[in-house]
Interface confidence: low
């Protein structure tokens, strides 16, 4: 088997958001900019007036889904010896139905109010061995992978880069990178997937 011919496709699943981290362990996302979920109905946190037709539900009932995503980790020209499996957070954190408006003639989605998003809740660190072309010595790295997702309330201070919808971002072509037959990004693959339906 010619399994050493990795370098032809090593960039195929590069995830530019992969973070090399210094310590191993499981830890939650830093929470300073996120308010406690339990505060969602208090008036000082954007609670709705009593006449509002939307009945409050526990955030856990919303469809924040954890999708498996398998890829190789890359660092420059080096690629992990094995693929890693992580989670992608997907879905909406809000009512899944249309609601009657105040005068009963039309339908509306939930009005503006507390903004909850399906975003990473916990991360895990995984040690990976990166194989490099040209006889370079393998490198040991630790990468941060999403371990769980949660509906979390956002504030205006929340880092918006966390909030990109994976499917939308994935379908967007990468800039400044010429396509090669074997060097297909996960984003290009997702576009291929969507076009296949």
């Amino acid at each position: 088997h010619h399994h050493h011919h990795h370098h032809q496709g090593w960039q195929a699943f590069k995830n530019d958001a992969t973070e090399i981290i210094p310590e191993l362990g499981e830890y939650p996302e830093p929470p300073p900019e996120l308010e406690n979920n339990k505060t969602m109905n208090r008036a000082e946190n954007g609670g709705r007036p009593p006449h509002h037709p939307f009945e409050t539900k526990d955030v856990s009932e919303y469809s924040c889904r954890e999708l498996h995503f398998t890829r190789y980790v890359t660092d420059g020209p080096c690629r992990s010896a094995k693929p890693v499996t992580e989670l992608v957070c997907s879905g909406q954190c809000g009512p899944a139905r249309l609601l009657p408006n105040a005068i009963g003639r039309g339908k509306w989605w939930r009005p503006s109010g507390p903004d909850f998003r399906c975003i990473p809740d916990r991360y895990r660190a995984q040690r990976v061995q990166l194989l490099c072309p040209g006889g370079e010595a393998p490198r040991a790295r630790k990468v941060r992978l999403v371990a769980s997702c949660k509906c979390k309330r956002l504030t205006r201070f929340h880092n918006q880069s966390e909030l990109k919808d994976f499917g939308t971002e994935a379908a967007r072509p990468q800039k400044g990178r010429k396509p090669r037959p074997r060097a297909r990004s996960a984003k290009a693959n997702q576009a291929e997937l969507e076009n296949a339906y």
Partner: nanobody
């Protein structure tokens, strides 16, 4: 919708062979690198082998020389030929395309008795 259906598992004695198949749909199979994973009871899912879109292959050390991954792009199917099976190969085996958001298939159980 991406669909992955694994089959071919079963009960076999140590030293025996099995051929697993994974029928896929919902994506352009020939463009994707395909992997087999396995999960033994109480253990994490682990990578077994990958076949790249161009045909190159890659294996975990513990199965090199015993397992062979192959693909049939016309049938949108990936295979795993497993020879010289050992009790420690007992697990549920899963296939998946790399680089796609997906839900795992149901897997196929392989049990190797000593």
């Amino acid at each position: 919708e991406v669909q992955l259906v694994e089959s071919g598992g079963g009960l076999v004695q140590a030293g025996g062979s099995l051929r697993l198949s994974c029928a896929t749909s919902g994506f352009t199979f020939s463009r994707f690198d395909m992997s087999w994973f396995r999960q033994a009871p109480g253990k994490q899912r682990e990578f077994i082998a990958t076949i790249f879109s161009g045909g190159d292959t890659d294996y975990i050390d513990s199965v090199k020389g015993r397992f062979t991954i192959s693909r049939d792009n016309a049938k949108n199917t990936v295979y795993l030929q497993m020879n010289s099976l050992k009790p420690e190969d007992t697990a549920v085996y899963y296939c998946c395309p790399l680089g796609i958001e997906y839900a795992w298939g149901q897997g196929t159980q392989v049990t190797v008795s000593s």
